[in-house]
Interface confidence: low
């Protein structure tokens, strides 16, 4: 059998095979050792018994999408049946004090591979044995502690495979410089040690995407905005836009990144090198927000100039830095293999990312202030609680509810929260009466809200002792 017979039905075209060379990967035309690594089809009854105590689940994730030229990292995590875990020696053991469906196991081991690997018969003087090999016959790398690595992972994509010895989780990074743009499929098959052979325990696949567009996300935040995810914001208050570029392999770390904003409200283009920007909309309505991100990224080099005439001496090839746009016809897409063969060249290419959103601007509560606090006189006998009136003003739209959160002086430990509807006139002046249990210092958070906004103010308040012999102290601020 060949690797492609074992690892999946996706058969890339000859062009794809030629142009998607992954560094360190091998062609899936190679032979697969079926004696050491048996191959089971889906639905084969042997899968049922491939693992003691249940099925192992493999979870494959990647940090896709990847900007072409950057590294994409794939991670595989094995999830064992309940109550099983891998110990420090790479053996699979039952968790202590963890009861599974079969009850507590007297034997702490699900698989005790250490005992087997210490019995190293069949090895020659180099410490290499005929069974410590990958499916293509390559020997296992002898890293320190390699005997504790009891899982064999075979990654397969674009007509190539990569083999890795590991524990219950592994990571593999692939450079995407030679990968065709668009969605691609990664498949992983996992084997475990079984005596002097291996048994398949899990198969998993996941789609990853390689793109020439910078993956861009924008978060939007505005003080007093009630729901930051609904793309509805308030008039006359700044919105903070924060651009997040998905670049997990730090491919653009040394790139100058430019951000070109159009806020859709006839304020013109705004160009910046800062990933955050503030903008205030002064009119209600619906606006189209557009962002273009531009970065000079490492990229394929354009074809070299024709060689000089023989009569002239050949110039030395110094390292050069060239730059051109990714939408320039020709070099970027023509023949990436040819382009990357120029020695000692370090070329750059402008990459772009785009973000568009429709945002709605509405009236909202812009500000809230406590202008007066009054201790309400209580009749005798003196109760243990105090009543305090807060006189509050606001600006902007008219609130429909008021909430007070009373907490300790650090404003961290909430003692009580009260919310109630309010009916406020155009002047936006209201009185909020709240009860305080006992004397002391309190933190009071007061919020006024309507459908779209929530404005907050805070104050520290000192409630005096209730001493019948002394007059009540009125607290104003």
């Amino acid at each position: 059998k060949r690797f492609h017979d074992v690892l999946g039905n996706e058969r890339p075209s000859a062009y794809m095979r030629e142009h998607n060379q992954l560094n360190g990967w091998s062609s899936d035309e190679n032979d697969w050792n079926e004696k050491l690594y048996p191959v089971w089809k889906r639905g084969d009854m042997r899968w049922k018994n491939s693992w003691k105590g249940g099925r192992v689940q493999a979870v494959l994730t990647s940090d896709s999408p990847a900007l072409v030229g950057s590294n994409i990292t794939f991670a595989v995590n094995l999830i064992f049946p309940r109550c099983q875990k891998e110990d420090a020696n790479g053996n699979i053991v039952y968790e202590k004090n963890c009861r599974n469906e079969a009850g507590l196991s007297a034997d702490p081991y699900v698989y005790n591979w250490t005992a087997w690997s210490e019995d190293s018969d069949g090895e020659n003087g180099t410490g290499q044995s005929h069974h410590n090999v990958f499916p293509d016959g390559k020997p296992f790398p002898h890293h320190p502690g390699w005997r504790r690595w009891n899982f064999i992972y075979v990654f397969h994509t674009l007509g190539q495979y990569f083999q890795k010895l590991g524990r219950c989780s592994v990571r593999v990074s692939v450079n995407t410089a030679n990968v065709t743009l668009g969605p691609q499929l990664m498949e992983v098959t996992v084997y475990r040690r079984h005596g002097r052979a291996y048994v398949p325990i899990a198969q998993v696949k996941d789609v990853y995407v390689v793109t020439d567009q910078i993956p861009v996300f924008v978060t939007m935040f505005q003080k007093n905005d009630r729901n930051s995810s609904d793309e509805t914001f308030l008039k006359d208050l700044p919105i903070m836009f924060d651009v997040l570029i998905h670049d997990p392999s730090h491919f653009l770390n040394y790139s100058t990144i430019n951000y070109k904003w159009s806020f859709g409200d006839n304020t013109g283009l705004f160009v910046s090198t800062n990933h955050t920007v503030n903008h205030t909309y002064v009119l209600n309505g619906t606006f189209s927000l557009n962002l273009t991100v531009k970065a000079a990224a490492p990229g394929p080099c354009p074809p070299p100039p024709p060689p000089p005439r023989p009569s002239k001496p050949t110039p030395s090839l110094a390292t050069t830095l060239k730059s051109y746009d990714s939408n320039t016809p020709g070099p970027a897409g023509d023949n990436p293999l040819e382009l990357s063969r120029i020695p000692d060249e370090n070329c750059q290419i402008n990459r772009y990312g785009h973000f568009q959103a429709t945002i709605t601007i509405v009236e909202g509560i812009l500000e809230v202030n406590i202008i007066q606090m009054t201790d309400v006189l209580m009749p005798v006998p003196w109760p243990e609680s105090s009543l305090i009136d807060f006189v509050v003003t606001c600006q902007g739209s008219i609130p429909t509810e008021v909430c007070t959160i009373i907490s300790d002086p650090t404003c961290e430990i909430t003692q009580n929260t009260v919310c109630s509807p309010v009916d406020v006139d155009e002047m936006c002046l209201l009185t909020v009466r709240r009860t305080f249990n006992g004397s002391g210092t309190y933190c009071v958070n007061l919020t006024l809200g309507d459908d779209t906004s929530l404005a907050l103010t805070s104050t520290l308040i000192s409630v005096p002792d209730r001493d019948p012999a002394s007059p009540l102290r009125m607290a104003n601020s």
């Epitope: 309940r82 110990d87 420090a88 202590k96 004090n97 009861r99």
Partner: antibody
């Protein structure tokens, strides 16, 4: 977003009982072992009890064995700690956490004093 | 029961410095060790899991290492927000046990 919200704390006299509850949201509650951890005022953290996924396995620190009962209701995504025969040394903030403290609630105060 | 001995109990260091906190288990805990940060009045937060795994969202200046019985938390380039108490927890077997804590003060 994972949320764990404890309730049921308060002040009681020694020998009395309290029942703490923890409401979970934002994750598949039945997939997780759950744990109660406590912290006496200005002191360190102390594991109290844990329970496995389906409630069939419960584990307690020696000083609370026979007095405290940990339980769960997976249908309601809730964790409970029934505390009987309370002692002054049980005073502290009680936190509900997933297994070994991956996510934590905000804590609830229990005061035991005469 | 597994005892976790954490040292030092307190630590004072300047901004930008590098500090280490140690936890010693009374027996092999097979990397089942978690480090937490706790600020006054707040719940603990996971920094490092499985001895060396950096929890999502935790700055890379935090790192964990160790195996067997001995583990350490290292903070490179201290920042003012790192002032807190740090705890280790062994999750190898019941009863789960915490270290006694290290209070880190920024000078």
């Amino acid at each position: 977003e994972v949320q764990l919200v404890e309730s049921g704390g308060g002040s009681v006299r020694p020998g009395r009982s309290l029942k703490l509850s923890c409401a979970a949201a934002g994750f598949t509650f039945s997939d997780y072992y759950m744990t109660w951890v406590r912290q006496a005022p200005t002191k360190g953290l102390e594991w109290v009890a844990s329970i496995n996924h389906d409630g069939g396995g419960t584990y307690y620190r020696d000083s609370v064995k026979g007095r405290f009962t940990i339980s769960r209701d997976n249908a309601r995504s809730s964790l409970y700690l029934q505390m009987d025969s309370l002692r002054s040394e049980d005073t502290g903030t009680y936190y509900c956490t997933t297994r070994a403290g991956w996510h934590w609630g905000q804590g609830v105060m229990v005061t035991v004093s005469s | 029961d597994i005892q976790m001995t954490q040292s030092p109990a307190s630590l004072s260091a300047s901004l930008g410095e590098t500090v280490s906190i140690e936890c010693l288990a009374s027996e092999d805990i097979y990397n089942y060790l978690t480090w937490y940060q706790q600020k006054p009045g707040k719940s603990p937060q996971v920094l490092i899991y499985s001895a060396s795994g950096l929890q999502d969202g935790v700055p890379s200046r935090f790192s964990g290492s160790g195996s067997g019985r001995q583990y350490s938390l290292k903070i490179n380039g201290l920042e003012s927000e790192d002032a807190a108490t740090y705890f280790c927890l062994q999750d190898s077997e019941y009863p789960l046990t915490f270290g006694s804590g290290t209070k880190l003060e920024i000078k």
